[in-house]
């Protein structure tokens, strides 16, 4: 008789989970020397061990600690850029400005990045078929218990001038609900962080609007403001070009605006 | 701006005792949890140890748990590391940083740790 197995609304684990975690961790250390030292299989015992055999909606920052612990690593902190909803454009920045660092260029973050994974109270079982859904199952479900621990620490870390890049296209460029304004923000250090900078990405072609004057982006402000940290905004209006401007900033077209 | 300053380091016989110190200036030291990382030669940077910003909390590599203990005075915004039955393996630049961690920018210029007979 099959045993019964709950299903939740969100999708399974990400197939070759282990496997894929296990290969990232080596890829990581290869390519970062200063993280040669890190045991892998360790790694992924302690990855494991956060999730596996434990309800998958009652999942705590505590059950990440032993992970944690041996994610730790050397981040500059006033090199760090945050983002919300423009993932790939804040990736493909730091592969160029290679003295940045969004949370993915992290080995946890890296480990991690577009997976999922869940396991089932009392058995050493991966749930491959469902994970709990944020929103239709739990909050407290490994995924996101994950990415708000990480995401935290990350922020508690920042110093100086703290760089976010926001998604002007989407109708909430800054949207409160996002990891970034729900965790992020909050966890900014007033005694370390003297200024936020926002980055809005323009989408369109010929969109020249001043973005900065957006609703959601003068709550940004205020947020912040409220922290007694300083708040800055810059338009991206071509991020093709900023981007092209990031590789060779003496290109004489670089000097105008972007 | 956050700035810190460790000494305390020297060398001494595996077995031996050393107590390491970090004066911290430039925030509310009381409001960070603060952390001891070190970094062995030629290898990459380990955690060690962490205390809340109250005291009240602390908790411990594998590796030092049972011989090393963390320890702050907030008023004299000093951080303390008591490191006893010290191994070999102990040898290392000792550091000090704010935060609990995993992600941290070092800022002092760290006090080096040598077990040797």
């Known amino acids: 008789v099959p045993r019964w197995r709950q299903q939740w609304s969100g999708p399974g684990t990400t197939k070759r989970f282990p496997e894929t975690v296990l290969a990232r961790c080596v890829k990581y250390t290869e390519i970062h020397p200063e993280m040669r030292h890190v045991d892998c299989q360790s790694v992924w015992d302690a990855f494991k061990g956060a999730f596996i055999s434990k309800h998958p909606c009652n999942i705590t920052e505590e059950d990440y600690q032993p992970l944690m612990k041996l994610g730790t690593q050397t981040v500059p902190c006033n090199k760090i850029l945050l983002w919300s909803r423009i993932k790939d454009l804040a990736h493909q920045f730091t592969q160029v400005q290679r003295d940045m660092f969004t949370l993915e260029d992290t080995l946890l973050g890296y480990l991690a990045d577009d997976l999922t994974w869940c396991g089932e109270f009392n058995t050493s079982k991966i749930n491959y078929q469902s994970c709990p859904d944020w929103r239709k199952d739990c909050s407290n479900n490994p995924v996101s218990v994950f990415w708000k621990t990480v995401s935290r620490r990350f922020a508690e870390a920042a110093c100086d001038v703290v760089h976010v890049m926001l998604n002007g296209s989407r109708s909430k460029i800054f949207d409160k609900n996002s990891t970034f304004g729900s965790v992020e923000v909050h966890n900014l250090q007033p005694e370390k962080v003297q200024t936020l900078e926002a980055w809005v990405i323009h989408g369109g072609r010929e969109d020249s609007r001043d973005l900065c004057q957006d609703p959601t982006i003068k709550e940004l402000e205020s947020i912040i403001s409220k922290r007694n940290i300083q708040f800055s905004c810059k338009n991206i209006y071509r991020p093709d070009k900023f981007l092209q401007c990031v590789k060779n900033p003496e290109d004489s077209s670089c000097t105008s605006e972007i | 701006e956050v700035q810190v300053l460790e000494s305390g380091g020297g060398l001494v016989q595996p077995g031996g005792s050393l107590r390491l110190s970090c004066e911290a200036s430039?925030?509310?030291?009381?409001?960070?949890?603060m952390s001891w990382v070190r970094q062995a030669p030629g290898k990459g940077l380990e955690w060690v140890s962490t205390i809340s910003g109250s005291g009240g909390t602390t908790d411990y590599a594998d590796s030092v748990k049972g011989r090393f203990t963390i320890s702050r005075d907030n008023s004299k915004k000093t951080l303390y590391l008591q490191m006893n039955s010290l191994r070999v393996e102990d040898t290392a630049v000792y550091y000090c940083a704010d935060g609990r961690g995993p992600f941290f920018d070092y800022r002092g210029q760290g006090t080096l740790v040598t077990v040797s007979s």
């Open positions: 430039g925030f509310t030291f009381s409001n960070f949890a």
